[in-house]
Interface confidence: low
């Protein structure tokens, strides 16, 4: 029978070798057979499955003149860049006559230096605050043991001892570098070096020390900053419009805040040129040579009310017999709070001053008892808020009303909240 058709006699004279290497390695597997007559096509198997798209080349060399003589057939399988999927058992397969022949197996394995799946990342942390770093590597070959280093100093006596995937750092007082080494049977791979920057802790206990209508004094307790002294603290103040509203902990204000720098110590700052009776939100952060701490939450504060800064305007006082008509307008100067009302004072030449609370009205009719012959009658008006009275207007003389003189156009209201007054 032609050579290679008997079950007990394999045509293979060279079997695939073994390849073990790292990812990306290029390698070639080779098998050789000797057959009589027409050379067969050589197929490659991986783990018993035919490789349909194998990158293989087949070379055939006749050993004689006649095509029925023996042929040497060489098939080479190229692995262009070793991947996980290439690993396995490789064999050559030929069909001769009515039989399959399979070569002895060769093995391809993926093996090299450890490969990092996760490496420590740069980050910022507050001084003396715990945090975690992560590092993960794999082979093959396994096992892969990790060794953490802080500022290039190993944190354990040997790889595999001490923390592995997660490194818990209870806190730092200076900016430090961390890396991890991955060790396996093939050697060592070093991760990237992560820089952990130590920032000052968030300031605590931001509070109000004193309040004035246009000024607030605030103080805070600085957080720890490690070995780096604080250079300054920054305070931001924000008008709290009802429409906008700053929520506690909101990272950034909706509009540009007023920003002030404070020398430290003392951890205290006076905020001037504020609006009276106005809600604000304030926050503070402190800076060292390493950077800015996180901001405190926004603290709601409010300036107190002040007194009106000017007297009522356009005061008019006229008299008609036993009645006096007085009217005025709101002060043009800032009220510095909520206007609660007006006080009116009038006085004759030789009579004591009479003080009245008019409320929020801007006009009053006074019923003068007697014949109304009191001479040199003058009127003063002042506006007031919860903080007190504003300045009084200059005295306005009460003029006699003559026919033809225009009566005030607004409604005259008879004063009922106080008794009628008469002069002796």
């Amino acid at each position: 029978a032609p050579r290679g058709t008997q079950a007990e006699e394999s045509p293979f004279v060279g079997n695939p070798g073994n390849i073990t290497g790292a990812r990306g390695l290029t390698g070639t597997l080779r098998c050789q057979l000797q057959v009589q007559g027409e050379p067969p096509e050589v197929h490659w198997l991986r783990d018993g499955q035919i490789l349909e798209l194998a990158d293989s080349t087949q070379t055939q060399v006749p050993l004689g003149e006649d095509e029925q003589d023996d042929w040497i057939v060489v098939s080479q399988l190229r692995i262009a860049s070793l991947q996980l999927s290439d690993a396995g058992q490789y064999q050559c397969l030929v069909f001769l006559g009515h039989q399959n022949f399979v070569s002895q197996p060769g093995y391809v394995g993926l093996e090299g230096l450890p490969y990092f799946l996760e490496e420590p990342e740069d980050r910022t942390v507050a001084a003396n605050t715990p945090f975690n770093l992560s590092c993960q590597a794999q082979g093959p070959p396994e096992p892969v043991d990790l060794l953490w280093l802080q500022d290039a100093v190993p944190l354990a006596t040997a790889p595999g001892h001490g923390p592995q995937r997660n490194l818990h750092v209870p806190g730092l007082n200076k900016t430090s570098s961390f890396s991890c080494e991955a060790h396996n049977a093939k050697g060592v791979t070093t991760s990237r070096t992560a820089t952990i920057t130590v920032l000052p802790q968030q300031p605590r206990n931001l509070h109000l020390v004193s309040r004035q209508p246009t000024e607030l004094e605030v103080a805070w307790t600085p957080g720890l900053s490690g070995i780096y002294p604080l250079t300054h603290c920054t305070l931001q103040a924000m008008l709290s419009d009802n429409e906008v509203g700053i929520q506690a902990g909101e990272p950034d204000p909706p509009e540009e805040p007023l920003t002030l720098q404070a020398s430290v110590p003392p951890h205290q700052l006076r905020l001037g040129s504020l609006h009276p009776h106005t809600p604000y939100h304030i926050r503070v952060a402190c800076t060292s040579s390493q950077g800015l701490s996180s901001w405190t939450h926004w603290l709601p504060v409010e300036t107190p009310e002040g007194v009106p800064l000017g007297p009522p305007e356009n005061i008019s006082a006229t008299r008609n017999g036993s009645q006096a008509f007085v009217h005025w307008q709101e002060p043009r100067a800032p009220l510095q709070g909520t206007l609660l009302g007006y006080r009116l004072a009038y006085q004759g030449q030789d009579t004591p001053e009479v003080l009245m609370d008019i409320g929020l009205r801007q006009e009053v009719t006074l019923e003068l008892q007697g014949d109304g012959s009191v001479s040199n009658l003058t009127v003063c008006v002042a506006a007031y808020t919860a903080a007190g009275d504003g300045p009084w207007s200059l005295p306005v003389p009460l003029e006699a009303w003559r026919p033809g003189q225009a009566q005030p156009v607004h409604q005259l209201v008879k004063e009922t909240s106080a008794p009628a007054f008469s002069w002796p």
């Epitope: 991947q83 690993a87 799946l117 996760e118 490496e119 995937r165 070093t190 991760s191 990237r192 070096t193």
Partner: antibody, heavy 114, light 112 residues
Framework: QVQLQQSGAELARPGASVKLSCKAS????????ISWVKQRTGQGLEWIGE????????YYNEKFKGKATLTADKSSSTAYMELRSLTSEDSAVYFC???????WGQGTTLTVSS | DVVMTQTPLTLSVTIGQPASISCKSS???????????LNWLLQRPGQSPKRLIY???KLDSGVPDRFTGSGSGTDFTLKISRVEAEDLGVYYC?????????FGGGTKLEIK
């Protein structure tokens, strides 16, 4: 050969949860990780996270923390991704893939609709 | 996160002509291990993505040698020497140097 076989299309109601699966074959399941990738219709690719079946450790893109939970069952060589509190924004094709993206599953279409 | 910016958005090429796609990263992709984890992927219409190139320039097995990848640091390029009909689809770049891994927005290759 390496294959990643994903579960079939899912239709879910807003607010519900869904669990997608990815069955691996052709290699040792515990040796390598499985990544998950989101692709909304006509959009690009977004990495959700990856899980390493040997340790069970999962790593997430910050954007998907709280939305996706990755798990793996070593006995069945299957990786899972659970998506919770579904909204229309979660309607997409979800792919599983090897960590360096040399192998991909065929994708699972998730439709969130009331 | 590292932003991967691909240009152009769409590329219309005649069969047999060359094509080039650019990918720029917001940070260097050179890792401390000396490797640059940048892949190119192709997603044909209605299919899963397929990796063409890894580590900037290494061709995956079965990928025709008309594809070449190049670049370093933050600038990378995928070139096709002679476009064929089977090349149409969306090409994505991907980086794995920095966590989290990120993809480019994609470049659609159309056949004129």
């Amino acid at each position: 050969q390496v294959q990643l076989q994903q579960s079939g299309a899912e239709l879910a109601r807003p607010g519900a949860s869904v669990k997608l699966s990815c069955k691996a074959s052709g290699y040792t399941f515990t040796s390598y990780g499985i990544s998950w990738v989101k692709q909304r219709t006509g959009q690009g690719l977004e990495w959700i996270g990856e899980i390493y079946p040997r340790s069970g450790n999962a790593y997430y893109n910050e954007k998907f923390k709280g939305k996706a939970t990755l798990t793996a069952d070593k006995s069945s060589s299957t990786a899972y991704m659970e998506l919770r509190s579904l909204t229309s924004e979660d309607s997409a094709v979800y792919f599983c893939a090897s960590p360096l993206f040399d192998y991909w599953g065929q994708g699972t279409t998730l439709t969130v609709s009331s | 996160d590292v932003v991967m910016t691909q240009t152009p958005l769409t590329l219309s090429v005649t069969i047999g002509q060359p094509a080039s796609i650019s990918c720029k990263s917001s940070q260097s992709l050179l890792d401390s291990d000396g490797k640059t984890y940048l892949n190119w992927l192709l997603q044909r219409p209605g299919q899963s993505p397929k990796r063409l190139i890894y580590l900037v320039s290494k061709l995956d097995s079965g990928v025709p040698d008309r594809f070449t990848g190049s670049g370093s640091g933050t600038d990378f390029t995928l070139k096709i020497s002679r476009v064929e009909a089977e090349d149409l689809g969306v090409y994505y770049c991907w980086q794995g140097t920095h966590f989290p891994q990120t993809f480019g927005g994609g470049t659609k290759l159309e056949i004129k």
